[in-house]
Interface confidence: low
């Protein structure tokens, strides 16, 4: 988890002088409770946005937006703490909006946004906005939380982001797998425009089961430039095991931008359909 760039982070708007600060995720109003605290945020919305860095790279970011309730508690609102928690790692990052002037009611509802939390493809986050100061220990909560799922690199807009492109999202190998005679598979795929090696990982399974009955790895050396974008054809010999008929072929590239952590592509060959055993037809028709 990180913030996008080191460019100035802005939270000021007409009628409010505000600054964005790094936060330890532990505002001191927990330690020094106040008697009067603001109400919770209203209508918290989290959306996937895309932002360019100063170097021109494109990153997915969480666009966080919320409004204030129209009650008198805005007179005691000193700012907000924005927290993003990555659920699979428990990593948390926070920033604090610090209001440098008092809020006043005006003809529009106060609205705040922040779009600088960089998020990763295929990850889930919990986003929390806490109004400050935080409530006394037994006070009503004044925060709102929402979960936010970031699409993976197959998503059309995600595919062209820097983290996805770095992991090889623009490569479409268009894998085809063909069953040949004599327990063989022919795997064909399109090479990318980089002189890097590939691995084909073959895993075979029984018809209805998920434990493997055969595994094989095949190394493909780095292609020459004239072979870029050409089809590579590899014939793999299967183990002659009855019922070991469902094959998953996975192609792992080793692009320089992602090394051994590149997106893998796979294709599956199902077991052949077994024809239903027909009822035997008697040689004669009984008369009774």
């Amino acid at each position: 988890l990180r913030l996008l760039d080191h460019r100035a982070l802005v939270c000021s708007q007409p009628g409010l002088n505000c600054t964005v600060k790094n936060s330890t995720c532990l505002d001191d109003s927990w330690i020094h409770p106040r008697n009067l605290t603001p109400s919770s945020p209203k209508d918290l919305q989290i959306q996937l946005h895309f932002a360019h860095t100063q170097q021109g790279d494109l990153f997915p970011v969480a666009h966080i937006e919320w409004t204030l309730q129209t009650d008198a508690s805005i007179l005691y609102l000193e700012g907000a703490e924005l927290s993003v928690l990555q659920l699979n790692t428990n990593e948390r990052l926070c920033v604090r909006f610090e209001f440098l002037s008092k809020l006043r009611h005006h003809h529009r509802r106060w609205r705040f946004t922040f779009s600088h939390f960089v998020v990763d493809p295929d990850q889930e986050y919990e986003v929390t906005v806490h109004h400050l100061p935080k409530p006394i220990p037994d006070g009503d909560p004044n925060h709102q939380s929402k979960n936010f799922l970031v699409p993976d690199c197959e998503h059309a807009r995600m595919k062209v982001t820097t983290p996805c492109m770095s992991s090889g999202s623009l490569w479409d190998p268009n894998i085809t797998v063909e069953t040949l005679e004599a327990h063989q598979l022919r795997v064909s795929f399109t090479l990318w425009n980089e002189s890097t090696h590939y691995q084909i990982l073959l895993t075979s399974f029984p018809h209805m089961e998920n434990h493997s009955c055969f595994e094989h790895m095949h190394h493909i050396p780095a292609p020459r430039p004239e072979e870029f974008h050409q089809r590579s054809n590899v014939t793999l010999t299967l183990r002659n095991l009855k019922g070991c008929c469902r094959h998953q072929v996975q192609i792992q590239p080793f692009f320089s931008s992602c090394l051994n952590d590149c997106l893998r592509h796979s294709a599956t060959v199902s077991c052949p359909e077994m024809p239903d055993t027909p009822e035997p037809i008697p040689d004669y028709m009984p008369l009774w």
Partner: nanobody, 118 residues
């Protein structure tokens, strides 16, 4: 091992000038953006300037535009920061850093202290 060694800091009066240098080793210097970042006493880290691999593109934080100039010499594996018209608010430890395209910096050198005071 990547190493970045900054030098050239010191005490200077408001309006004065300093030239910071950073000597890099342990990586292919000419293939990286380089940055200067700074940390004022008791404050967070602030990005100051970036320079592209071949020096063809430079970027500055608004507060130093027109006063600071970043440059590099790939033959000497060095990056420089020429600081003119220095102000008290430029007082900070200045770090040279290897910049990644995401806008984040790793690793940093040990820093050189610039103090602007009369």
């Amino acid at each position: 091992e990547v190493q970045l060694v900054e030098s050239g800091g010191g005490l200077v009066q408001p309006g004065g000038s300093l030239r910071l240098s950073c000597a890099a080793s342990g990586f292919t210097f000419s293939t990286y953006w380089m940055s200067w970042v700074r940390q004022a006493p008791g404050k967070g880290v602030e990005w100051v300037a970036n320079i592209k691999e071949d020096g063809s593109e430079k970027q500055y934080v608004d507060s130093v535009k027109g006063r600071f100039t970043i440059s590099r010499d790939n033959a000497k594996n060095s990056v420089y920061l020429q600081m003119n018209s220095l102000r008290a608010e430029d007082t900070a430890v200045y770090y040279c850093a290897r910049a990644y395209s995401s806008g984040w910096f790793d690793p940093w050198g040990q820093g050189t202290l610039v103090t602007v005071s009369s």
